[in-house]
Interface confidence: low
């Protein structure tokens, strides 16, 4: 009897959908695996007789529930199927956006770049899939614990009237208000403001 794959899970970030599993202990030899997805009541092969312990399902439609399954095989024997269900638009993890930060005197000028969708055309981003896409920005004075959050209306934001010659750190994430779903925070970017540009009286 061939044991089934273990710890079967979907690792999906920005619609790069990788079904992953672990090979069970099997004394007779090396196992291979076949992974399939359900397409209108018929299971279609995606990865056949692979020695890998993952299979790329990024070409699935982003909408709707998908049934995926994987089994282990050895010679003419095979394990039972292990099934999981997966809805990309609901389940994919929203990766961190990109961010460009520029210091202009006592202001930080930020521009945000929605994460690109993996395995798609160059111009496609997560913003194109989710109509309610917005950004959360978190900033703080370097070395302090107090953080401030804002929700920019656009793909850019300016933090004005900051303390001069002070280092501020900023990070951004995608947020979907209609789903109450937040993405991963970007790595903090820390920049030092320069002088206050106000003209003395």
């Amino acid at each position: 009897m061939v044991p089934p794959p273990e710890n079967v899970r979907m690792n999906s970030v920005n619609f790069k959908n990788i079904l992953q599993w672990e090979s069970p202990a099997f004394a007779k030899g090396n196992l291979t695996f076949t992974a399939q997805y359900l397409s209108y009541r018929i299971f279609q092969d995606k990865c056949m007789n692979t020695t890998l312990t993952e299979c790329d399902f990024s070409s699935l439609s982003k909408y709707g529930d998908h049934t995926l399954r994987v089994r282990a095989e050895f010679a003419d024997e095979h394990s039972d199927w292990v099934n999981i269900t997966f809805c990309p638009v609901d389940d994919t993890i929203i990766g961190p956006p990109g961010m460009q930060v520029e210091v202009l005197a006592d202001s930080l000028h930020m521009r945000f770049l929605a994460p690109k969708i993996e395995n798609e055309y160059e111009t496609w981003t997560m913003k194109n899939v989710y109509n309610s896409w917005t950004y959360n920005v978190q900033y703080w004075k370097n070395g302090t614990d107090e953080k401030f959050q804002i929700t920019p209306q656009y793909d850019f934001e300016v933090l004005r009237n900051l303390e001069p010659w002070t280092t501020y750190c900023v990070q951004v994430r995608g947020f979907l208000p209609d789903r109450n779903k937040a993405g991963e925070w970007s790595e903090p970017v820390c920049e030092q403001t320069t002088h206050d540009e106000t003209v003395p009286s």
Epitope: S39, S59, L60, S61, K62, Y63, Y121, W124, N128
Partner: nanobody, 125 residues
């Protein structure tokens, strides 16, 4: 919201031709995967043809050499030119679109995000 509206269906004699159209609205990208599907009475819906954003096409074996899928990005319209029609081509034909690359491992999978209402094609002898 993406909307798809098919037209061009009708009745035709065996060996005849028809051209189906699918007008798409609600998005500006030409990079959608689009496809034609059909469903005959009492049968499963099946893929007929798909076309990718770059224009690459795939066909079901049953229509290869007879049907041609194409699109006009400027008009946001998808077409299916059907020649040498057979009685077994009789079905409701649906246009579908999805914000994804067409799946290269199957001719036309049916897990598309957006669907039209369909247009009837009847081939009689």
């Amino acid at each position: 919201q993406v909307q798809l509206q098919e037209s061009g269906g009708g009745s035709v004699q065996v060996g005849g031709s028809l051209r189906l159209s699918c007008a798409a609205s609600g998005y500006t990208y030409s990079n959608y995967c689009m496809g034609w599907f059909r469903q005959a009475p009492g049968k499963e819906r099946e893929g007929v043809a798909t076309i990718d954003g770059d224009g690459s096409t795939r066909y079901a074996d049953s229509v290869k050499g007879r049907f041609t899928i194409s699109k006009d990005n400027a008009k946001n319209t998808l077409y299916l030119q059907m020649h040498s029609l057979k009685p077994e081509d009789t079905a409701m034909y649906y246009c579908a679109a999805d914000f994804a690359l067409c799946d290269p491992t199957v001719v036309a999978h049916t897990d598309f995000g957006y669907w039209g209402q369909g247009t009837q094609v009847t081939v009689s002898s």
